[in-house]
């Protein structure tokens, strides 16, 4: 009973143009093109988008016009393949254009780059931005979409429209304010941080679909929606899961127009049926479309219904478990996951999926045994260690976070992860460990009932960043193993890794530890990254260094930076004191 049972349309492009409206159509086509051709200049993309839009308008006027019956992939692929510099700019991606649909689109998808070689986005002065905004608002906002989309090729397109709307609102309000910077900069910082988080969350959804298949994504969705909508019955949750899977499959597959259209339909359906879904949707459903969809996606969990009986009766104590499992596997396991998840908003989604997998594995084994009931009677006892492992890990790490604070907690994780997988590039280790460390300030403030879903599901998102970055240039078999064996066991897999004893320490290179006066003008965050980069390099040179040794070197390093940044002749200080620091560090670490 999915909501997306549309009649066939003579012209798909006309259909989507009419459904979405010109503004959203153009924005989504721009996002799609920028996510595929990440190196193309802005102006080239705008030209392509305008051509597609003009063509779509001809199809709206006459659906039988030439080429209007072609699929969106055919139309968009043909347009992308007209780019003159495709071979020079993208190399083998140009070979995609020799293929037919659907292979051509698959080829483009495979060439999406999670870490494109693009310059860091530097924020201009506020007055410069406000002038640009006022001079040409449309171009200014398109440029925002383009810059985000090309750097985040899996960004959830309908959600990017929501970000763009907030971006526009921030400039509209703040460029008229007395203190433009005080008004605008915090808003832009918030959008940047939320945008990065949104991109990473969506990247995990796409990885789940693309690497582990639709069944894995659906299981994730059943668990999450059952936690969020515990009063909704199983059929309702199943229907939402089917529709949500379609939406994300489309967006992850580059079908952004269909995705945005279907997401709007899903939001409409949810709001029309909120009485049977959740009592928490009322406010969301009063908002305009983009805000509504975002709000629904972030809505808090509804209260658990009263009178939920024990699950043991149906799933453990009954002698008919194997008959029910054998005759209706997917429904039975789906019902188990739904029932367990709606009773446990205090568990992470990945833990719930581990429990469901354990239950399934037990039934597979026991239903073939001589006495199945005797065999599966203690299955819930097997859940105890699975539940306690993340609980203990979170307790220990939150204690460590509270003791150290975020920066030093990140450093502890940097050391931990560099020792586990020292082959991984330093920028990746720094980025991932910094993000892992943010779990502290994000989740440790929560009461126990909310800590695990916050922490472990966030860690899944961050570890997926490691997995996708590592996949581009694989250097560690251990990372590959943890990333590919099981989606839900990634975090326990990485947690279980010990120091890599096979690693041959990196040759010492003084240049890596040479610093200059430019460090003094960096923001606090950038300065932290410099220090954390040095810390990773230290561990790569001396993987067996103790915490105390590393702390001593890092303290000396911090003092050195502080001293030289206060010096009159900073550059000389950095050169002379730097040499001394390197020598002292080498001695301290026995290099």
């Amino acid at each position: 009973r999915g909501v997306f049972r549309r009649d066939a349309h003579k012209s798909e492009v006309a259909h989507r143009f009419k459904d979405l409206g010109e503004e959203n159509f153009k924005a989504l086509v721009l996002i799609a093109f920028a996510q595929y051709l990440q190196q193309c200049p802005f102006e080239d993309h705008v030209k392509l988008v305008n051509e597609v839009t003009e063509f779509a308008k001809t199809c709206v006027a006459d659906e039988s016009a030439e080429n209007c019956d072609k699929s969106l992939h055919t139309l968009f692929g043909d347009k992308l393949c007209t780019v003159a510099t495709l071979r020079e700019t993208y190399g083998e991606m140009a070979d995609c254009c020799a293929k037919q649909e659907p292979e051509r689109n698959e080829c483009f998808l495979q060439h999406k780059d999670d870490n494109p070689n693009l310059p860091r986005l530097v924020r201009p002065e506020v007055d410069v931005m406000c002038t640009a905004f006022h001079d040409n608002e449309e171009t200014f906002l398109k440029k925002y979409l383009y810059e985000i989309a090309r750097r985040h090729p899996y960004f959830y397109a309908p959600e990017l429209l929501f970000f763009a709307k907030r971006y526009k609102a921030a400039f509209t309000e703040c460029c008229q304010a007395a203190d433009k910077a005080a008004c605008l900069l915090p808003k832009l910082d918030e959008l940047r941080d939320e945008g990065k988080a949104s991109s990473a969350k969506q990247r995990l959804k796409c990885a789940s679909l693309q690497k582990f298949g639709e069944r894995a994504f659906k299981a994730w969705a059943v668990a999450r929606l059952s936690q969020r909508f515990p009063k909704a019955e199983f059929a309702e949750v199943s229907k939402l899961v089917t529709d949500l899977t379609k939406v994300h499959t489309e967006c992850c597959h580059g079908d952004l127009l269909e995705c945005a259209d279907d997401r709007a339909d899903l939001a409409k359906y949810i709001c029309e049926n909120q009485d049977s879904i959740s009592s928490k949707l009322k406010e969301c459903c009063e908002k305009p479309l983009l805000e509504k969809s975002h709000c629904i996606a972030e809505v808090e969990n509804d209260e658990m219904p009263a009178d939920l009986p024990s699950l043991a009766a149906d799933f453990v104590e009954s002698k008919d478990v194997c008959k029910n499992y054998a005759e209706a596997k997917d429904v039975f396991l789906g019902m188990f996951l739904y029932e367990y998840a709606r009773r446990h908003p205090d568990y992470s989604v990945v833990l719930l999926l581990r429990l469901a997998k354990t239950y399934e594995t037990t039934l597979e084994k026991c239903c073939a045994a001589a006495d199945p009931h005797e065999c599966y009677a203690k299955v819930f006892d097997e859940f105890k260690p699975l539940v306690e492992e993340p609980q203990n890990l979170i307790k220990q790490n939150c204690e460590l976070f509270e003791q150290l604070g975020e920066y030093k907690f990140q450093n502890a994780l940097l050391v931990r992860y560099t020792k586990k997988v020292p082959q991984v590039s330093t920028p990746t280790l720094v980025e991932v460990s910094r993000n892992l460390g943010k779990v502290g300030s994000k989740c440790c403030k929560h009461p126990e009932a909310k800590r695990m879903p916050c922490a472990e599901d966030y860690l899944s998102v961050v570890l997926n960043q490691l997995c996708v970055l590592h996949e581009k240039t694989p250097v560690s078999d251990r990372v590959t193993k943890c990333c590919t064996e099981s989606l839900v066991n990634r975090r326990p897999c990485f947690s279980a890794l010990e120091v890599d004893e096979t690693y041959v320490p990196k040759e010492f290179n003084a240049e890596t530890f040479t610093f200059h006066a430019d460090i003094c003008t960096l923001s606090e965050k950038e300065r932290q990254i410099k220090k954390q980069t040095a810390l990773v390099e230290l561990v790569k040179h001396k993987p067996k260094a103790t915490k105390e040794q590393l702390k001593a070197v890092m303290d000396d390093f911090a003092a050195f930076v502080e001293k030289c940044c206060k010096a009159d002749d900073k550059e000389t200080c950095f050169a002379e004191e730097g040499k001394k620091l390197v020598a002292a560090s080498q001695a301290a670490l026995g290099l």
Epitope: F234, A235, P309, A313, D314, F315, E317, N324, A328, M335
Partner: antibody
Framework: EVQLVESGGGRVQPGGSLRLSCAAS????????MNWVRQAPGKCLEWIGH???????YYATWAKGRFTISRDNSKNTVYLQMNSLRAEDTATYFC??????????????WGQGTQVTVSS | AFELTQSPSSLSASVGDRVTITCQAS??????LAWYQQKPGQPPKLLIY???DLTSGVPSRFSGSGSGTDFTLTISCLQPEDFATYYC??????????FGCGTKLTVL
């Protein structure tokens, strides 16, 4: 409003057949195990059988063979087909919703019942 | 299939009394027992599930206890509206379920 409404009861000759219906509103039948329970005048409650979310039907030992439970999710209705009826089948027949898709109990939601009389 | 024996089959009491009804299973059913109240011309109403969990909206004077084979329903302070027939139901051991034969509670 969440409710169950039974229909199809009435008077039938011994040896005859009858099909009872239980129409659900306010929820989807497919999410639950749906049960039939009967009660002869002044007597105990007697469970007949149920059909679960996997479309698997289970019956009380005495009901196997003569009674069949089915459902039509598109009509949100569950049925009880009764054959070879006897005088002792005279009772009020209730439809009741299980707690979950594979639950045999407890039953929080019941219909008001439909009366079946088997006599010549 | 297991059997449930309810006792007594009938019971007379006065408003304000404390009343206890028992239900015995022929084999262990863990805590999978429910108690229902039924009034003439009405379907049964769920009072207690999983032996001791009170259904929402049911007054707290009703309580259940027991596990394995022996179960008890207690009404701590009988009210006029409590005079009815009470049934126990065992479930969960298989995909079948069984009811006790009822206890009729009447005014003394």
């Amino acid at each position: 409003e969440v409710q169950l409404v039974e229909s199809g009861g009435g008077r039938v000759q011994p040896g005859g057949s009858l099909r009872l219906s239980c129409a659900a509103s306010g929820f989807s039948l497919s999410s639950y195990a749906m049960n039939w329970v009967r009660q002869a005048p002044g007597k105990c409650l007697e469970w007949i059988g149920h059909i679960n979310a996997g479309d698997i039907a289970y019956y009380a030992t005495w009901a196997k063979g003569r009674f069949t439970i089915s459902r039509d999710n598109s009509k949100n209705t569950v049925y009880l087909q009764m054959n070879s009826l006897r005088a002792e089948d005279t009772a009020t027949y209730f439809c009741a919703r299980g707690a979950g898709g594979f639950s045999t109990g407890p039953f929080k939601l019941w219909g008001q019942g439909t009366q079946v009389t088997v006599s010549s | 299939a297991f059997e449930l024996t309810q006792s007594p089959s009938s019971l007379s009491a006065s408003v304000g009394d404390r009343v206890t009804i028992t239900c015995q299973a022929s084999e262990s059913i863990n805590s999978r027992l429910a108690w229902y109240q039924q009034k003439p011309g009405q379907p049964p109403k769920l009072l207690i599930y999983d032996a001791s969990d009170l259904t929402s909206g049911v007054p707290s004077r009703f309580s259940g206890s027991g596990s394995g084979t022996d179960f008890t329903l207690t009404i701590s302070c009988l009210q006029p509206e409590d005079f009815a027939t009470y049934y126990c139901q065992g479930y969960g051991g298989s995909s079948t379920t069984t009811f006790g034969c009822g206890t009729k509670l009447t005014v003394l």
